[in-house]
């Protein structure tokens, strides 16, 4: 028995299955509480840059400084964690770049320190002293076996030096590790000599080898990753997303839904709507409309952008995610204010997912 009346088809997957859908993995900036963080908006030719956090407009305050393409957060706290975006408005178009900020005392796994360190690992050599690659911090490499719960972030590091400065590449199970080998790809931070995989799934299990080489030699080190999970799971949605938002009539707003799934996720954005002046069908169930869903013709389904909003756009927006195992959904409310009222952050209400056991 469906719990709603369909205004548009809300079948689980698109009619044409997506061939290349990937879970988006924004750049992650990690800071310890109390530290300052500076991020540069990685967009070119920006006439005007606007910033959002969790889909809500971000303005300057006593801890947040916005200068040109830079965002500075002074004395970071865990409340500063979230999904940030900078939007570059140009004369003909606009473009948005997303990144995550994680203010935490410890990284999920694979390292004892966060990603703001590493400067000590980048050893500069006297240009005359030619030297084959060597490890600069073997303590960070002692733990070879990493047993990590699914959906966690894994970081492997191989801090090295040499002259000329060595290059680093990674192998998985002895073969070249390519971005397309895992949903969401991976990140290599050359300045930190690290490989980062977010939201690991069972197929990420295996041996990961860093190969560090220059013209005078090559060294390597292998880590073993075990992803601990005994049965496939329904999708997991990041708590607090999408976040409630408010804007004025004519304004723009974004809702973001962060998805972790070890099986292909299908994302739908759904809104309660009226049909013939009624919010409910003859059966007493609410009318719902699918605003966006993942598929061949849909880009970045995790983000729902609304432009030039009207009062009719106010209401509840549902992010519904499914894989072959099950579903999850979370929702947020959009408040549309009259033109004279400035938008403000609403009291946050995190909708409970519907799959609690």
């Amino acid at each position: 028995r469906p719990s709603f009346s369909l205004v548009e088809d809300t079948t689980l997957e698109p009619e044409e299955p997506p061939t290349k859908y990937q879970i988006s993995q924004p750049e992650v900036y990690v800071a310890a509480p109390g530290e300052s963080l500076e991020v540069r908006c990685l967009l070119k030719d920006a006439a005007v840059i606007s910033w959002t956090k969790d889909g809500v407009h971000l303005g300057p305050n006593n801890r947040t400084v916005l200068i040109g393409e830079y965002l500075q957060i002074k004395g970071a706290t865990p409340r500063d964690s979230g999904l940030y975006a900078c939007t570059a408005s140009r004369t003909v178009d606009s473009e948005t770049w997303y990144f995550m900020v994680n203010v935490t005392d410890a990284i999920s796994s694979g390292d004892d320190e966060d990603d703001t360190d590493g400067a000590e690992d980048f050893v500069s050599e006297n240009s005359n002293n030619k030297r084959a690659p060597y490890w600069t911090n073997t303590e960070k490499m002692e733990k070879r076996l990493h047993a990590v719960p699914a959906a966690n972030t894994v970081k492997f590091r191989c801090p090295a030096g040499g002259n000329p400065m060595p290059t680093m590449r990674w192998l998985k199970n002895g073969k070249e590790f390519k971005q397309e080998h895992r949903i969401g790809g991976y990140k290599v931070r050359n300045q930190h000599w690290s490989l980062i995989m977010e939201s690991v799934v069972p197929s990420d299990k295996g041996n990961y080898t860093c190969v560090v080489e220059n013209e005078y030699g090559s060294i390597n080190h292998t880590y073993h990753l075990d992803v601990v999970e005994r049965s496939p799971h329904r999708p997991i949605l990041q708590a607090g997303l999408p976040a409630n938002a408010s804007t004025v009539v004519g304004g723009d707003v974004e809702f973001v839904c962060k998805v972790y799934s070890d099986a292909q996720p299908h994302i739908q954005w759904i809104k309660h709507v009226e049909k013939n002046g009624s919010k409910y069908g003859p059966d007493g169930l609410p009318y719902l409309k699918v605003l966006k869903h993942s598929g061949i013709n849909s880009s970045n389904a995790e983000v729902l952008a609304l432009f030039n909003v009207t009062e009719a756009d106010a209401g509840e927006y549902i992010c519904k995610v499914s894989n072959y195992i099950g579903q999850a959904n979370q929702s947020a409310w959009l408040t549309v204010l009259p033109k004279q009222q400035a938008p403000g952050r609403e009291k946050e209400i995190t909708a409970s997912p519907d799959y609690l056991e």
Epitope: R1, P2, F4, L12, G206, Y324, I325, E357
Partner: antibody
Framework: QVQLVQSGAEVKKPGASVKVSCKAS????????IHWVRQAPGQGLEWMGA????????SYNQRFKVRATLTADTSTSTVYMELSSLRSEDTAVYYC??????WGQGTTVTVSS | DIQMTQSPSSLSASVGDRVTITCRAS??????LNWYQQKPGKAPKLLIY???NLADGVPSRFSGSGSGTDFTLTISSLQPEDFATYYC?????????FGGGTKVEIK
């Protein structure tokens, strides 16, 4: 423990319909897709469709979209698969499965004039 | 639809042999692949999910590998109870297509 118990064998004439049931127990019924897979004699496995009992969402293989109907009764933790306009090539064993991890014992449907 | 091609379609092996079955997807399915074992008159049994992860209650002699388009199921030392038909399945997107099956017979 998780169990899926299917209804008994059926013999149908061409053009008729058949409704196979799958009763689930041992887990929270609403929280997992129930998939239907069929296997013709001596052949491989073919996915037909799935239903999410919590809200009745369905997804079908295009080959069966017109003829197959999946429904769920949360009060009895039972899913039904109805296949209409039967033809001889629909003779097969029909399985229900919870997210492909746990499977029913299968229901044999024979279509013969 | 994503096509799944298994090879070989059948093989003969002896107890204790190492057996390898391959599965190729017509397009990149990342690690979204399951392996099943089926014995005559019985329902399929999940062996491996997510390409590499052993399902509950499955002996460790079974292992899965691969990602993208090429996948392998390996039985390290074939046991008498392993003689059966094995199927791979795409679980990336609907329709969730199966491979044609590989029948493992006694030599």
């Amino acid at each position: 423990q998780v169990q899926l118990v299917q209804s008994g064998a059926e013999v149908k004439k061409p053009g008729a319909s058949v409704k196979v049931s799958c009763k689930a127990s041992g887990y929270i019924f609403r929280n997992y897709y129930i998939h239907w897979v069929r296997q013709a004699p001596g052949q491989g496995l073919e996915w037909m469709g799935a239903i999410y009992p919590d809200n009745g969402d369905t997804s079908y293989n295009q080959r069966f979209k017109v003829r197959a109907t999946l429904t769920a009764d949360t009060s009895t933790s039972t899913v039904y698969m109805e296949l209409s306009s039967l033809r001889s090539e629909d003779t097969a064993v029909y399985y229900c499965a919870r997210a492909f991890t746990y499977w029913g014992q299968g229901t044999t449907v024979t279509v013969s004039s | 639809d994503i096509q799944m091609t298994q090879s070989p379609s059948s093989l003969s092996a002896s107890v204790g042999d190492r057996v390898t079955i391959t599965c190729r997807a017509s397009e990149n399915i990342y690690g979204a692949l399951n392996w099943y074992q089926q014995k005559p008159g019985k329902a399929p049994k999940l062996l491996i999910y997510g390409a590499t992860n052993l399902a509950d209650g499955v002996p460790s002699r079974f292992s899965g590998s691969g990602s993208g388009t090429d996948f392998t199921l390996t039985i390290s030392s074939l046991q008498p109870e392993d003689f059966a038909t094995y199927y791979c399945q795409n679980v990336l997107s609907t329709p969730y297509t199966f491979g044609g099956g590989t029948k493992v017979e006694i030599k």
